[in-house]
């Protein structure tokens, strides 16, 4: 939602967290601001304090409950407001009617581990974190592998078009250090975006057996 020169963007992690970023040109530096969430069909409301992340941008997380509790559904609409202190009052700086399941960004996948590693192959598994049971199997993943001498940006993306929490990396170089990352996205939601990348998992392929053809 945009008001004046302000941009207000929020995402729901599908369980109990709404993360918001508010940016504004020439915003007051010393003002206390917060995000306030008012669901249309729930008894609770929630507030978080916006903290600076850059010169003209602030962020905060609305914690709606226990991490794995299902606090919102596809029919919920949450009025989200940015409020900034002026004198003793609060001023509404931005407002949006937020449809949580149209604005999804899941938590980064966790518990990455090497299941099996060979000279040219590596099987890696992971878990999704705090993802709603509503998705059933309607998730997709992207993965990337960092090779020596390259950057993450140069790494080709591997797409898994189904809920598959493992991958077998092939055509790897023996006795070489690699790093691996994965991210997840629900298929649902007009403004849904990819989760952050997982923490990188470092692994090393096995050296080629001495005196054998590789």
């Amino acid at each position: 939602a945009v008001n004046g020169t302000s941009q207000f963007t929020c995402f729901y992690n599908s369980r109990a967290n709404i993360s918001c970023v508010w940016s504004q040109d020439g915003a007051l530096q010393d003002t206390s601001c917060q995000v306030h969430a008012w669901p249309d069909r729930r008894r609770w409301n929630q507030t978080c304090e916006l903290l600076p992340v850059s010169q003209a941008s602030w962020a905060c997380n609305l914690i709606l409950g226990a991490p794995d509790s299902q606090k919102l559904t596809t029919v919920d609409i949450v009025t989200l407001r940015v409020l900034c202190r002026e004198g003793v009052r609060w001023r509404v700086m931005a407002i949006q009617d937020f449809k949580p399941f149209e604005n999804l960004r899941l938590m980064a996948p966790i518990s990455l581990q090497v299941v099996h590693v060979e000279t040219h192959r590596c099987n890696i598994s992971w878990e999704i974190s705090q993802a709603s049971h509503y998705f059933e199997r309607h998730l997709e993943f992207e993965a990337r592998t960092l090779s020596p001498g390259h950057t993450w940006e140069e790494a080709p993306l591997l797409t898994l078009k189904q809920k598959q929490e493992w991958i077998c990396l092939e055509t790897l170089t023996p006795d070489t250090q690699y790093e691996f990352q994965v991210r997840v996205k629900p298929l649902q939601g007009e403004f849904t975006t990819w989760s952050p990348w997982s923490q990188p998992l470092a692994f090393r392929t096995k050296p080629a057996a001495l005196g054998k053809d590789t």
Partner: antibody, heavy 121, light 112 residues
């Protein structure tokens, strides 16, 4: 029905202090701000500052800082405005007015009847 | 501080005729949230001020539709389409965009 009832007229000597009260009814006192506005005889309106009774937080117009103190007593839904070091230019009608804690639309919707303060030697 | 200047100081009008009051601010009063917090108050003789218009053109509850507000940036206008006897009094513009909030000097509406 929202009502703000103010204390009666006061006559004060220069250098003295005056304390004006504003009793609220017909709404939840701690949910709204109380602003104070003054109007010198034959003059315009001047916003002095305000208090949020919910937490006692105050904000004063720089013009009155150091001389004005706004307080409240939530047990009797009453706000107070005290002005010290009075001079003849402070002769005015002092109004309290209610305002929304979140300034969405307007600053002040309901006003008290006003309290006349006369500063004279 | 934002200075609000009203014209005219005095406005003699005929019952049933329109009236127009101008208010000019010394700087733009568009708030950084994109809204313009320009309000109009009416003060009848011997009474407290009463809110008529907020955010330039919105009528407060119970205000007759003969009152209308318009304008943007630094120039604003209050119009009374057909003046009635009960409209006599002083009208003040007010800006709530920049602290300290400030009032105009007032325009006295009287019947000719």
């Amino acid at each position: 029905e929202v009502q703000l009832v103010q204390s009666g007229a006061e006559v004060k000597k220069p250098g003295a202090s005056v304390k004006v009260s504003c009793k609220a009814s017909g709404y939840t006192f701690t949910d709204y701000v109380i602003s104070w506005v003054r109007q010198a005889t034959g003059q315009g309106l001047e916003w002095m500052g305000e208090i949020y009774p919910g937490d006692g937080n105050t904000y004063y117009n720089e013009m009155f800082k150091g001389r004005v103190t706004m307080t409240r007593d939530t047990s009797i839904s009453t706000a107070y405005m005290e002005l010290s070091s009075l001079r003849s230019e402070d002769t005015a009608v002092y109004y309290c007015a209610r305002g929304s804690y979140t300034y969405d639309n307007y600053a002040m919707d309901f006003w008290g009847q006003g309290t006349t303060v006369t500063v004279s030697s | 501080d934002v200075v609000m200047t009203q014209t005219p100081l005095s406005l003699p009008v005929t019952l049933g005729q329109p009236a127009s009051i101008s208010c000019r601010s010394s700087q733009n009063i568009v708030h950084s949230n994109g809204n313009t917090y320009l309000e109009w108050f009416q003060q009848r003789p011997g009474q407290s001020p009463r809110l008529l218009i907020y955010k330039v053109s919105n009528r407060f509850s119970g205000v007759p539709d003969r009152f209308s507000g318009s304008g943007s940036g630094t120039d604003f206008t209050l119009k009374i389409s057909r003046v009635e006897a009960e409209d006599v009094g002083v009208y003040y513009c007010f800006q709530g965009s920049h602290i300290p909030w400030t009032f105009g000097g007032g325009t006295k509406v009287e019947i000719k």
